[in-house]
Interface confidence: medium
């Protein structure tokens, strides 16, 4: 049992053109808070799949306001780390999702209170009992600066906090068969809670509850001696049956450790020697130092000169992750402007910009009325790449050259005859219906029925934001 | 499994109050955002109040202003509108929303009934 910790350093913009506006403005305060979920091994980084490691929810950071127009700074934290306790053992390999989210707290009625304003994953190797691990992730415009680390709970030590320590009985050593723990060293390797009843003196376990026999005993308690004298092999898993040691698989056959660690038997077990950058019981974890060239696709590694300090990975344009593992979708940052079609081609991006645009980004905005008149009185409106004429009363077409009749679109409903006027147009009504455009029956009674408004939504299920 | 109910609507007179609870059960109360909307027969629904999941913040609809309080009780469980002054336009099916950064969560309505 442990827990693992996150320290959020900072969360504001990254480096870099296009620095994100503010969440927060003088007319919608807010707080920041953080979500971070974890799941054990290389498993499924997908926000929806469970947290089976654990999750955990920062306090909310201090209220906020921004100045108007100003760019956004890195933005008030919570107090304190984000804890998630974990029961059984540290995995050594884990996934993990920071959220970070935003509390709005202005005087506005509409809208959900909370929203996402940023999502972060990764899987990284971390032993437990470490030193703290830092990291910086990037989504898309804003940065994330966080440390992390996972610790056993006493009585629990080791890199996967499987092993169990006590208080020393005797005051010079441990007892026979147990180590110190390091690093606490006026402690004493403790034996793990076997199975009821398993035999402390012929009996062992790696496992909570199971029980080992050693050699020349057996039984499912190890409590029946094993008797040698028709049997072949000096060792094995022993017969409860016969009471004979039958040949099997000593603890270093399949050679249990991992990354090409060499396994050496010992009077209870197996130990790993470990290859440079693992280490644990079976070599499972990996130390990783910039020596072991940790970053991909170009990225340079800085510091983690040994196993016990951190590496940081600079990624060359178009990458990011902890170890430059990720492809920037840099058309996700929506770079064009005024709508302009976005292409990553790689070794650069690449704007298509809208008719009446121009520029890298599509930035400038081309003058659509230059050179352009607009007949009988019309004035001329610039947007969206083409210009476009708003005509005086009487005048229609592209250009304001046609005359409108604006009676043509038989406006008047229920057999209402329509009049052009120098204001537009009048509808004379049909017996029975009144309204500007003779919309409205007349009741009988005088009362005019009025449309509804359209229906509202119904409640139903619990809906789903994200 | 999630369950918001609504009480304490009824008739009552036009300046008259009434008190609506609104009691959440199957998921963490104080985590959501509460609202209180409503909706009168042939219009949409509109949101009346809102309050934080700490109570803290609370904001309301104009036509409420003044004259309705929003109010929770984490502890309980239980998301209360106190609306006093009651017109005949604030007639209308009355619901409560649990909202969170995840997912949303509706009760069935309590009938509030303006009417001399």
């Known amino acids: 049992a442990g827990v693992f910790e996150l320290q959020i350093h900072s969360f504001g913009p990254g480096p870099g053109p296009g620095a994100p506006r503010s969440p927060c403005s003088a007319r919608l305060p807010c707080r920041l808070f953080f979500r971070v979920c974890l799941k054990p091994g290389l498993s499924e980084e997908a926000a929806e799949s469970p947290c089976a490691l654990g999750a955990a929810l920062s306090a909310r950071g201090p209220v906020y306001t921004e100045q108007p127009g100003a760019p956004a700074p890195d933005l008030p934290l919570p107090d304190g780390l984000l804890q998630v306790p974990f029961r059984d053992a540290w995995p050594g390999t884990f996934s993990f999702i920071i959220e970070t989210w935003r509390e709005e707290l202005g005087d506005q009625i509409g809208g959900p209170a909370w929203s996402l304003l940023a999502r972060v994953a990764g899987r990284r190797r971390l032993a437990a009992g470490g030193p703290w691990a830092r990291d910086i992730q990037r989504a898309g415009a804003w940065e994330l600066r966080f440390s992390y680390r996972a610790r056993c709970e006493p009585p629990a030590v080791g890199t996967a906090c499987t092993r169990l320590c006590r208080p020393r009985s005797a005051p010079s050593r441990c007892g026979p068969g147990l180590r110190p723990c390091a690093p606490l060293e006026d402690e004493c390797e403790a034996p793990l809670v076997c199975r009821a009843g398993c035999s402390p003196e012929h009996g062992f376990c790696e496992q909570p509850g199971e029980c080992r026999c050693l050699e020349g005993w057996t039984g499912p308690l190890c409590t029946v001696p094993v008797s040698t004298s028709s049997c072949l092999s000096p060792r094995g898993p022993s017969s409860a049956t016969t009471g004979c040691l039958v040949p099997g698989p000593g603890p270093c056959d399949g050679n249990p450790c991992a990354n090409g660690g060499s396994c050496s038997e010992t009077p209870r077990s197996f130990e790993c020697t470990c290859p440079r950058g693992f280490y644990g019981l079976r070599c499972e974890v990996s130390g990783v130092t910039c020596a072991d060239g940790p970053c991909f696709n170009g990225g340079l590694c800085v510091g983690g000169a040994d196993p016990d300090s951190a590496y940081i990975c600079h990624c060359p344009p178009g990458f990011q992750g902890s170890n430059c593992e990720k492809r920037v979708d840099r058309c996700s940052l929506q770079p064009c402007r005024n709508g302009g079609l976005c292409l990553d081609l790689g070794h650069a991006l690449r704007c298509r910009c809208r008719a009446g645009f121009a520029g890298p980004r599509c930035e400038h905005d081309l003058d659509d009325c230059a050179g352009r008149a607009c007949a009988n009185g019309g004035t001329c409106v610039e947007g969206g790449g083409a210009h476009r004429c708003s005509c005086a009363l009487g005048f229609g077409g592209r250009d304001c050259r046609e005359r409108a009749d604006p009676c043509a679109a038989r406006p008047c409903a229920h057999g209402g005859r329509c009049y052009a006027h120098f204001s537009g147009l009048v509808c004379a009504c049909a017996p029975g219906y009144m309204g500007a455009r003779c919309e409205f029956p007349v009741h009988p009674d005088g009362a005019s029925a009025l449309p509804a408004a359209p229906p509202g939504l119904r409640p139903g299920d619990p809906q789903r934001y994200l | 499994q999630v369950q918001l109910v609504e009480s304490g609507g009824g008739l009552v007179q036009p300046g008259g109050s009434l008190r609506l609870s609104c009691a959440a059960s199957?998921?963490?109360?104080?985590?959501?955002?509460v609202n209180w909307y409503r909706q009168a027969p042939g219009k949409e629904r509109e949101k009346v109040a809102r309050i934080s999941s700490t109570g803290t913040t609370t904001n309301y609809a104009n036509s409420a202003k003044g004259r309705f309080t929003i109010s929770r009780d984490n502890s309980k469980n239980t998301l209360y509108l106190q609306m006093n002054s009651l017109r005949a336009e604030d007639t209308a099916v009355y619901y409560c929303a649990a909202e969170r950064f995840d997912s949303n969560y509706w009760g069935q309505g309590t009938l509030v009934t303006v009417s001399s």
């Open positions: 199957g998921f963490d109360f104080s985590t959501y955002t």
